[in-house]
Amino acid sequence: STGASSHCQKTSLRVNFEDIGWDSWIIAPKEYDAYECKGGCFFPLADDVTPTKHAIVQTLVHLKFPTKVGKACCVPTKLSPISILYKDDMGVPTLKYHYEGMSVAECGCR
Amino acid sequence: STGASSHCQKTSLRVNFEDIGWDSWIIAPKEYDAYECKGGCFFPLADDVTPTKHAIVQTLVHLKFPTKVGKACCVPTKLSPISILYKDDMGVPTLKYHYEGMSVAECGCR
């Protein structure tokens, strides 16, 4: 998601499962840090935002035609799992140590 | 990149290498379609935008706290190569049939 004037980076995003209605099936944790990718993808794209060639091209086109083409976007490029205790289809509390794709590990410009 | 009210989709983006200063080393093609990912990632995220769990979580948090958290972003999720003729370090015209990551194959919400 886009941010103010800071460059693309990972920031904390505390998520409470009750707020998103997932407390009906996720028993634990009550909340976790999903993290969020915030900030702009400005020219020149730094190595730490691991830009694809397409992101570099789009950034250059945006520089030339800012009203025609948007900037590349700061998004999660690598996700991490979390451990959860959830109710399965039979209502049995079940532990899952690697519930994939729930937390941002790395952000980049895409 | 973000769009108006349409949902996340792939749109044409003709790129002229002269416009971005790459004509100094890319001899052919003169231009190509890089495509662009445009549009919003609105709730509920459809299957065709192949949302990650994190994107779904972020969308739900945005729904609850729209000023605190941004929407997921519409970005390339799969890229395609193009063929290029370029000048190598020796200045020799060189054909590369798979110059990776230059064109959008698929867009999604991340």
């Epitope: - | 190509y32 063929s83 003729l85 190598d88 020799v92 054909l95």
Partner: antibody, heavy 114, light 107 residues
């Protein structure tokens, strides 16, 4: 200077195989694909395929799929083109040519005759 | 495969003439087009690459133009050493194809 030197003329019987070599010098062999092109007597140019000398991956013209094999030996900067199940129509001059066809070998005449 | 059609298939011209050979691709090939000259018993020689770029060492009387499907090779003032067969070639598709050739003869 940059050059490609091919092996000598060959006479083969129908059904046999021929292997033509192409030795590169004056440049880094692994930096450029090697193409093979043939030309039947009095006819035009026909592209057969290429080999990437780094990984050895190949791309063959549909017409020659299953009959042509392109290989390379990077230690001696040499590319090879082997054509099997020869027929009289394969009588031609066979050329190797560097990536963008800027440098060509001198050609190897392969005659297929019973 | 992409078909490359050259015209004319042969032409007669005199020294000093301006000669134009055309090449049409069966589908768009951007500017992935090359022109070659071939003399009897010799390997082809690259004249023009990427439709309009003159290969190093080639005389400036040779020029190329075009993009998409229609291309032209022009010899501004034909010289005695220019009598040969000329081929166009597309390198846009991974299956490379040549035109059938244009023979330039002395009138």
């Amino acid at each position: 200077q940059v050059q490609l030197v091919q092996s000598g003329a060959e006479v083969k019987k129908p059904g046999a195989s021929v292997k033509v070599s192409c030795k590169a010098s004056g440049y880094t062999f692994t930096s450029y694909y090697m193409n093979w092109v043939r030309q039947a007597p009095g006819q035009g140019l026909e592209w057969m395929g290429w080999i990437n000398p780094v990984q050895g991956n190949t791309n063959y013209a549909q017409k020659f799929q299953g009959r042509v094999t392109m290989t390379r030996d990077t230690s001696i900067s040499t590319a090879y083109m082997e054509l099997s199940r020869l027929r009289s129509e394969d009588t031609a001059v066979y050329y190797c040519a560097r990536n963008y066809f800027d440098v060509w070998g001198q050609g190897t005449l392969v005659t297929v005759s019973s | 495969d992409i078909q490359m059609t050259q015209s004319p298939s042969s032409l007669s011209a005199s020294v000093g003439d301006r000669v134009t050979i055309t090449c049409r691709a069966s589908q768009t090939i951007s500017n992935f087009l090359a022109w070659y000259q071939q003399k009897p018993g010799k390997a082809p020689k690259l004249l023009i690459y990427a439709a309009s770029n003159l290969q190093s060492g080639v005389p400036s009387r040779f020029s190329g133009s075009g993009s998409g499907t229609d291309f032209t090779l022009t010899i501004s003032s034909l010289q005695p050493e220019d009598f040969a067969v000329y081929y166009c070639q597309q390198l846009y598709a991974e299956s490379i194809t040549f035109g059938q050739g244009t023979k330039v003869e002395i009138k």
